[in-house]
Structure formats: structure tokens, C-alpha cells
């Protein structure tokens, strides 16, 4: 049954016409509207866009639109005083130096105010060095170099090629490997798909093409010098010093044909294995140090970007609901781009800009949600999810108490194969009703469902006939709502074929060549996958923000509870002779996922059969389901991560795009034959079982009859 | 509506000070700058220099470092030019001009009506 | 210091006509120039902002434009209000420079 019919809700041809009214064509002609000059954050630029949309969704019909502005850490490269890698001879002349801008794509050759590519909050710096190849600069590429390979990367500039993890992970993992400097660089392997031309032909990264992106290890707490409360006019600031998650050594991005420059030259040891080769015509020694010939040449970094407190601006849009205006249902995506913003953000925000349009164009004719729908156009994601957390401090108090969902509305593709969704299980039956209910965009499909399509292609690994869901992790800016706030959240883009297409993200991201060329000629000419993620969204946010009773099912949570358990427990077990000999047990932590499993069943029952006609009860029913996501948060925190508050999901420690789950106990056992101190690590992994327990325990109580 | 309101024309000995002011209403005064621009008679525009009232920034044309300060005042939404050692050379109007205060802007967007400096012994 | 020409200094011309004034920058200044406006009692008033947008309440019949160095002022059809005084400005870097003035007379 649909999500419609299960729940008696809102009469079906409100769906369709809010559906119906979204068109391919008013998406494109948004795009281009808002990708025809740079919109960096903290620019008159942005700010700009941020009064035109604020102005078009008034115009639109919504009730109110304001902006809401914060002063906030922003990161930006010095004007007259440019970022760049140098070689230097032993007399320490200059005899190569990385190019100082990308080459701008055809058409945009007169346009001004394109940041050139830097990594944002770098520090100031002018290491040199040897270099030293360190692969992804992932945690397991540091242990290889330095536990198999024993190189020592202290006092060494680190050269890692994107992709994999987040950037600012590589960061942190060379900051702890006593690195002085590191420079990330786009290899081909993994940014330049076999059979495609680099842009403008094709939709690959040329040469000198350069990923920007912020290097941050924030953990959730939005402005670096306002941790948990909003950057507004009367905020107290800590010091740089004291500032949150800010590098510590220069970092700066390249290209791959710098990088062939740097990398040509390497000698030392060569590569453990072929993982550690990427497609340039280049040995991938790991080093320290050039070969031979060029051993006295070193590598010198010039960087001197500044940070700077610098004002931003979301746009927040209100549609207030008729029946329970305290409920908030709220779609949300950034607006500031690196550069032109193609695809990041720019996508998504005429997704969300034809959505509101679509909903305005309702209410106009006098309908109105049952809920209130909040829209808001964030700003400075790129430099840290900073916008959409610093108002989500601004109103905690108001979203703890009266947030239903978060539907995050960022890049509406990645690729053209099919759709990509992560979300709260809550949201798992609420995804498949509606991608049964929406016709698929993609060939060979022809007449059938999306849900038929996005099954045949990216199923579930666990369930046949379904398709894949994946947990929610970071990078975006759900983040504050559901790892920190507890808010059910959920995302969803058409991706790419992750079978064929091993490059990370997409080959032009974060870069010049992200132009609405690139999606009208390459991605989506007909924008038919930009409309089906519109009605995804769309969809979702209608059937959330206008269902008699929220369509959440608790039992999901359930199995995914079990499944997680499951996983961590496989994982303690590798160390069987510890865990006899710290007494550690998990019966604890699989009892409270019972109580749940039996719980939410007849919690589930009930919300069959209960009076719906009775406001109160109703009110209940809803409330139980609004606030379990919220019974799931630890108002302590995870350890050394006081803004990851949810105790089933936060992002990996390793990689803050990924969801990692019961990441307490998962970081407690990580790694842990290398503990100094075996008791008192095994002895967190005990006390981490023992929150993830309670927490899960608490949180079935709250499906409980209530009286 | 955005409105830069100056004060009135000064008349000064050479040798003295004068301090001009440009009284901001309709926007948001932190989220803007003040830019200073000098047009002696029958002649062009000179920048003088800016000031960001929220982080309290000044920059200044080299030319009048040290003739030209700068200040403001956010809690009356004004922004001042102190001008010193005043010589006939100092004789002009002088504008206000709204500029935005981010990494990229637009420059001065709204303009004050000028005040007019006449420095004679 | 960028230096920025502007020419003609002074340009007489009939209503309804098309004109056009011209600033040459001495470095690359990207689309950072504006075009002011002047009234004969000294109110200054931008008219278009990086190079060829139009500020809000300015009349379409205002363009810019720009070739290379050379960066333009058009007015399609002259009325009689526009017989004034305009300036061009750079703002690439600092300190922000003006060119000499275009005054626009009525022939």
C-alpha cells in the first residue's frame, strides 16, 4: 500500500497537482539564472542571490521570506599575494611553479571574481621539503607507510591524491604523521572516466582543472569561533588559537598536470602495491625525496590565504501549515558555490526554487499543508555547513521541540544512472511508496516505476527486490539537524553506475569547469533526472509536511538496529581471547534491540488502529513517531565530538562523508591491538556498549503506551 | 529606501581640522562599508579610502594616508572623515558612497549628496 | 595605480541618437567597472555595475559592455535628461580609480 492509503491521508490529487506543476523546463531556466557568475560566500555576489531569491519565493506565494545573517570564520586567498608550489634547486631558485588560476572554460573568459583554487583555512606557510606520496591519505594508507613500510612523514610535504575520503580527514591524518605541508592533487584514476573528453568535449577534468574545498575538521560545530551557539552580533568569539577543527599546516590543491611535475621526480621507495598507482605516466614512489639526478631539489609551499570573520546570509521561507503550524517540515540547500556552481549547489537550488514555486502555485488556488513547510537557501556550506548550522544554534530550542523532517537539497546529480538515497530508516517506507508512485526518467524504463528502475540498478545488498538505502553521513548540511539535533533527515540525487565508474564524486567538482554547460550538454539535456529528484523531494516533503499521520515506520529502525548490532559485535569478535578476558558482552546492547523490535511491532498495531478522528490521541501517535529519531541523541555527545550526538549514526572518524553506525562502540574497538593500554580500552569499548544499550533501551520506552 | 545623508558645507582655515560625517539609514549599516571620494572643482573623482563599520577595517588610498581618517560609529549608523593640516589643496566635495563589506563586491552602489570643504584664510 | 582613459571628454549629441563612451584600463581589471552618473548639482547615481549589469530603476535604454581593454558606455536613444556628466570606475584593486569624465551636451 502507499504511504496514502495506509495512513489516510491528504486526498491524492493534492500529491498530483503539487507534482504535476513541476516542470523540467522552469528547473533549467533556474540553473541558468543562478550559474552565470560566481556566488562565493561572504561575496556581494551571493548576497545578491540571496535578495533574488528571497524576493522570488515571496513572489511565489510563500508567507514570509527573511534572511537570516551570521558573522562567521571565512577563508580566502590573499588578492595580491597568490597560493603556489614551487620546485626549488639547492641554491633555492624556483625552477617550476604550479599555475596560479585554471584556464576558464569557453565563454566565461571575461568573467571576474573566480576565487582560484586554494584550500580553504589554510594556514599562512612557506615549508619546504622533501615530498612524500602518501596515496589517499587515508588512516589505513598512513599505517601502511608507516607500520609496513616504516617512512617516517615528520618534517616531510605530503603529496595525496584526492578522493575516497573528505579532504579535511587527508588533513588531520597528515597533521598527525607530523607532516609540515600537504598538497592534494586530482589523479586521472580517479577524476577522469576511460572513453570521455576532458571539459569542454566531455564531462572530464582537464589537466588544469583543481578541486577547491574547505580542510576543516569541524565535527559538527558550525562557525570555528562560535562552537554550539549562533555567530550573531553580540557573540562572544574564541581566539584563532582556540578556534575549532582549524589545519595546522599549509595544505593547497593542484591539478594532475602539476602534479605529473611533482610526482615525476620521485624517488625512494616505490609503491607497496598497485592500490597505489593512479594513471599519470609517473612510478608513484612513495619517496621522501626526489630521485637520483634531482635529490637536492626540494618542494616549497607559498601560501597566504587569511581567515576573516565575515558576514553570511540564509534565506529562510516559510509555508505555515493550517492544521499544526507548530510541526516543521523543512527543505533546505546551500546557494554558495565554489565558483559557478553547475552542479554544487546549483542543481539542487533550482530543485528546491521550482519546488517552492510548485507549492506557492497551491496555496495560491488556497490550499495549505497541514504542517508548516520551511524552506531555506544556506549559505557558506562550502566552508563548513556554516549557514544552516548557526541558525540551527540560532533556533534549537524551537527545532528540538517542533522538527518532524529535514529533507537536504544539495547536488540534484552526481551522474545520470539512477537515484541515490540516504536516509533515516524512519523514512525507508515513505522513500519506497513514493519511487513506486513516480515514473522512472531512465531508458529502458519506459512506462515503469522509479522504484523499478533504481531497484534493478543499485539493489539492496540485504533485501531482494528492494533497493539500496544508505546511511546518512556528513558533508552536508543535514548534519546539525539529524547527527546533532536528532531531526529525522533524509537526501536524495541521481548518481552514477558506482560499478563502472570507480572516480570519487564527480570528475569537474569544486572546480571552474562546473558550468550549467556542463549538465545542459553532458548530464541532463531534457533536466528529466533534475524533475524526478524534484518529485523525490518534492514528494517527500508534501507527504511529511501533509500526511494525517507522519510517515514514519518504527519498525525499520528496528531491523537496521539489529543488523548494526550484528555488525559491531562480528567486529569485537576478531579479538576473542580480550573480550573473555575483559568480560565484554554485547547481551546487553541485542536485549535493548529486542525490547525495541518488540516495541515499535506493537507500537505499529496500535498506529493502525487507533481513532484517528481524535486530535489528541493523534497528537500523540505523531509526537511518539517526531520524537524517536530525537530519543536517539546522547546529549553528551560522542567522545571528543560534543556536537555528533546521535548514538546509532555519526560521521566515520575516518571520512566524514560516511556514516558509520553505533560509532561509539565502533571508534572504542578501532585499531585497538595498537592500545597502550589494553584495560582501559577495552574498558571504553564496555562503557560505549553500555550507552549504545541505554540509548536504544530509552528509545523503545518512548513507543511504549504511554500511560 | 537606502539613504546617505551628509552633513553640511564646511568652511576652514588652512592648518586646521574639519570632521565630516554621511549618516546611513535604510539597510543594514555592518553589513555595508563607507567609501570616501574627493571631486575638486570642474575636476574628476578621487578615491579617498573605505571603512567597514562591523569589523572596523580601514583602507586608504596612500596618497591621503595621513591627511584622511576614518572612523564610525554603528550604533548611530554614521560614518566620519576627519580631514587635518588642511591646505587650498583640500578644497572640494566630498562623497560618501555606499560599498559592500565581503571578499568580492560591486563597489560604491549608493552615493551620499557630498559636502562641500572650502579651506581659505 | 591602474589608470583608466576615459574618452571623449566632452561629446555633444542630438535626442534620440546612440552614443557611446569608452574607459581604456592601463592593466587587467576582469568585469570590475561600474559607470556613474552625474547631475549638474553634484548627485552621483551608479548606472551599471561589472561592466554590463544594469542597477534596479536604471532605464534599458543604458548598456555596457566591454573588448579586451576597452570597456563601453552605450545609450541607445538619447533623452534629455541624459545630458549630463559620467564617470567610469575600477574597482579590480585597490586604490580604486576613476577615469577623467565623458561630459555629455546637448547639440
Known amino acids: 500500500k502507499s504511504s496514502n492509503e495506509a495512513t489516510n491521508i491528504t486526498p491524492k490529487h493534492n500529491m498530483k497537482a503539487f507534482l504535476d506543476e513541476l516542470k523540467a523546463e522552469n528547473i533549467k531556466k533556474f540553473l541558468y539564472n543562478f550559474t552565470q557568475i560566481p556566488h562565493l560566500a561572504g561575496t556581494e555576489q551571493n548576497f545578491q542571490l540571496a535578495k533574488q531569491i528571497q524576493s522570488q519565493w515571496k513572489e511565489f506565494g510563500l508567507d514570509s521570506v527573511e534572511l537570516a545573517h551570521y558573522d562567521v570564520l571565512l577563508s580566502y586567498p590573499n588578492k595580491t599575494h597568490p597560493n603556489y608550489i614551487s620546485i626549488i634547486n639547492e641554491d633555492g631558485n624556483e625552477i617550476f611553479n604550479t599555475s596560479l588560476f585554471e584556464p576558464p572554460p569557453p565563454g566565461y573568459e571575461n568573467v571576474s571574481d573566480i576565487v582560484p583554487p586554494f584550500s580553504a583555512f589554510s594556514p599562512q606557510g612557506m615549508p619546504e621539503g622533501d615530498l612524500v606520496y602518501v596515496n589517499y591519505a587515508r588512516t589505513e594508507d598512513f599505517f601502511k607507510l608507516e607500520r609496513d613500510m616504516k617512512i617516517n612523514c615528520s618534517g616531510k610535504i605530503v603529496i595525496a591524491r584526492y578522493g575516497k575520503v573528505f579532504r579535511g580527514n587527508k588533513v588531520k591524518n597528515a597533521q598527525l604523521a607530523g607532516a609540515k605541508g600537504v598538497i592534494l592533487y586530482s589523479d586521472p584514476a580517479d577524476y577522469f572516466a576511460p572513453g570521455v573528453k576532458s571539459y569542454p568535449d566531455g564531462w572530464n577534468l582537464p589537466g588544469g582543472g583543481v578541486q577547491r574545498g574547505n580542510i576543516l575538521n569541524l565535527n559538527g560545530a558550525g562557525d570555528p569561533l562560535t562552537p554550539g551557539y549562533p555567530a550573531n552580533e553580540y557573540a562572544y568569539r574564541r581566539g584563532i588559537a582556540e578556534a575549532v577543527g582549524l589545519p595546522s599546516i599549509p595544505v593547497h590543491p593542484i591539478g594532475y598536470y602539476d602534479a605529473q611535475k611533482l610526482l615525476e621526480k620521485m624517488g625512494g621507495s616505490a609503491p607497496p602495491d598497485s592500490s597505489w598507482r593512479g594513471s599519470l605516466k609517473v612510478p608513484y614512489n612513495v619517496g621522501p625525496g626526489f630521485t637520483g639526478n634531482f635529490s637536492t631539489q626540494k618542494v616549497k609551499m607559498h601560501i597566504h590565504s587569511t581567515n576573516e570573520v565575515t558576514r553570511i546570509y540564509n534565506v529562510i521561507g516559510t509555508l505555515r501549515g493550517a492544521v499544526e503550524p507548530d510541526r516543521y517540515v523543512i527543505l533546505g540547500g546551500h546557494r554558495d558555490s565554489w565558483v559557478f556552481g553547475g552542479i554544487d549547489p546549483q542543481s539542487g537550488a533550482a530543485v528546491v526554487h521550482e519546488i517552492v514555486r510548485s507549492f506557492g502555485t497551491l496555496k495560491k488556488e488556497g490550499w495549505r499543508p497541514r504542517r508548516t513547510i520551511l524552506f531555506a537557501s544556506w549559505d557558506a556550506e562550502e566552508f563548513g555547513l556554516l549557514g544552516s548550522t548557526e541558525w540551527a544554534e540560532e533556533n534549537s530550542r524551537l527545532l528540538q521541540e517542533r522538527g518532524v523532517a529535514y529533507i537536504n537539497a544539495d547536488s540534484s546529480i552526481e551522474g545520470n544512472y539512477t537515484l541515490r538515497v540516504d536516509c533515516t530508516p524512519l523514512m525507508y517506507s515513505l522513500v519506497h511508496n513514493l519511487t513506486k508512485e513516480l515514473k522512472s526518467p531512465d531508458e529502458g524504463f519506459e512506462g515503469k516505476s522509479l522504484y523499478e528502475s533504481w531497484t534493478k540498478k543499485s539493489p539492496s545488498p540485504e533485501f531482494s527486490g528492494m533497493p539500496r538505502i544508505s546511511k546518512l553521513g556528513s558533508g552536508n548540511d543535514f548534519e546539525v539537524f539529524f547527527q546533532r539535533l536528532g531531526i529525522a533527515s533524509g537526501r536524495a540525487r541521481y548518481t552514477k553506475n558506482w560499478e563502472t565508474n570507480k572516480f570519487s564524486g564527480y570528475p569537474l567538482y569544486h572546480s571552474v569547469y562546473e558550468t550549467y554547460e556542463l549538465v545542459e550538454k553532458f548530464y541532463d539535456p531534457m533536466f528529466k533526472y533534475h524533475l524526478t529528484v524534484a518529485q523525490v523531494r518534492g514528494g517527500m516533503v508534501f507527504e511529511l509536511a501533509n500526511s494525517i499521520v507522519l510517515p514514519f515506520d518504527c519498525r525499520d529502525y528496528a531491523v537496521v538496529l539489529r543488523k548494526y548490532a550484528d555488525k559491531i559485535y562480528s567486529i569485537s569478535m576478531k579479538h576473542p581471547q580480550e573480550m573473555k578476558t575483559y568480560s565484554v558482552s554485547f547481551d546487553s546492547l541485542f536485549s535493548a534491540v529486542k525490547n525495541f523490535t518488540e516495541i515499535a511491532s506493537k507500537f505499529s498495531e496500535r498506529l493502525q488502529d487507533f481513532d484517528k478522528s481524535n486530535p489528541i490521541v493523534l497528537r500523540m501517535m505523531n509526537d511518539q513517531l517526531m520524537f524517536l529519531e530525537r530519543a536517539f541523541i546522547d546529549p553528551l555527545g560522542l567522545p571528543d565530538r560534543p556536537f555528533y550526538r546521535h548514538v546509532i549514526y555519526a560521521p566515520s572518524s575516518h571520512n566524514k562523508y560516511a556514516g558509520e553506525s553505533f560509532p561509539g562502540i565502533y571508534d572504542a574497538l578501532f585499531d585497538i591491538e595498537s592500545k597502550v593500554d589494553p584495560s582501559k580500552a577495552w574498558g571504553e569499548v564496555k562503557r560505549q556498549i553500555y550507552v549504545a544499550a541505554f540509548t536504544v533501551q530509552a528509545a523503545a520506552e518512548t513507543l511504549s503506551e504511554v500511560a | 529606501q537606502v539613504q546617505l545623508q551628509q552633513s553640511g558645507a564646511e568652511l576652514a582655515r588652512p592648518g586646521a581640522s574639519v570632521k565630516l560625517s554621511c549618516k546611513a539609514s535604510?539597510?543594514?549599516?555592518?553589513?555595508?562599508?563607507i567609501s570616501w571620494v574627493k571631486q575638486r572643482t570642474g575636476q574628476g573623482l578621487e578615491w579617498i579610502g573605505e571603512?567597514?563599520?562591523?569589523?572596523?577595517?580601514?583602507y586608504y588610498n596612500e596618497k591621503f594616508r595621513g591627511k584622511a581618517t576614518l572612523t564610525a560609529d554603528k550604533s548611530s549608523s554614521a560614518a566620519y572623515m576627519e580631514l587635518r593640516s588642511l591646505t587650498s589643496e583640500d578644497s572640494a566635495v566630498y562623497f560618501c558612497?555606499?560599498?559592500?563589506?565581503?571578499?568580492?563586491?560591486?563597489?560604491?552602489?549608493?552615493w551620499g549628496q557630498g559636502t562641500s570643504v572650502t579651506v581659505s584664510s | 595605480d591602474i589608470q583608466m582613459t576615459q574618452s571623449p571628454s566632452s561629446l555633444s549629441a542630438s535626442l534620440g541618437e546612440r552614443v557611446s563612451l569608452t574607459c581604456r584600463a592601463s592593466?587587467?581589471?576582469?568585469?570590475?567597472l561600474n559607470w556613474l552618473q552625474q547631475q549638474p548639482d553634484g548627485t552621483i547615481k551608479r548606472l551599471i555595475y561589472?561592466?554590463?549589469s544594469l542597477d534596479s530603476g536604471v532605464p534599458t535604454r543604458f548598456s555596457g559592455s566591454r573588448s579586451g581593454s576597452d570597456y563601453s558606455l552605450t545609450i541607445s536613444s538619447l533623452e534629455s535628461e541624459d545630458f549630463v556628466d559620467y564617470y567610469c570606475?575600477?574597482?579590480?584593486?585597490?586604490?580604486?580609480?576613476f577615469g577623467g569624465g565623458t561630459k555629455l551636451e546637448i547639440k
Open positions: 571603512i567597514f563599520p562591523r569589523r572596523g577595517n580601514t
Open positions: 592593466q587587467d581589471i576582469g568585469s570590475s
Open positions: 570606475l575600477q574597482y579590480a584593486s585597490s586604490p580604486y580609480t
Open positions: 535604510g539597510y543594514t549599516f555592518t553589513s555595508y562599508g
Open positions: 558612497a555606499r560599498v559592500f563589506d565581503g571578499y568580492y563586491n560591486y563597489a560604491m552602489d549608493y
Open positions: 561589472a561592466t554590463s
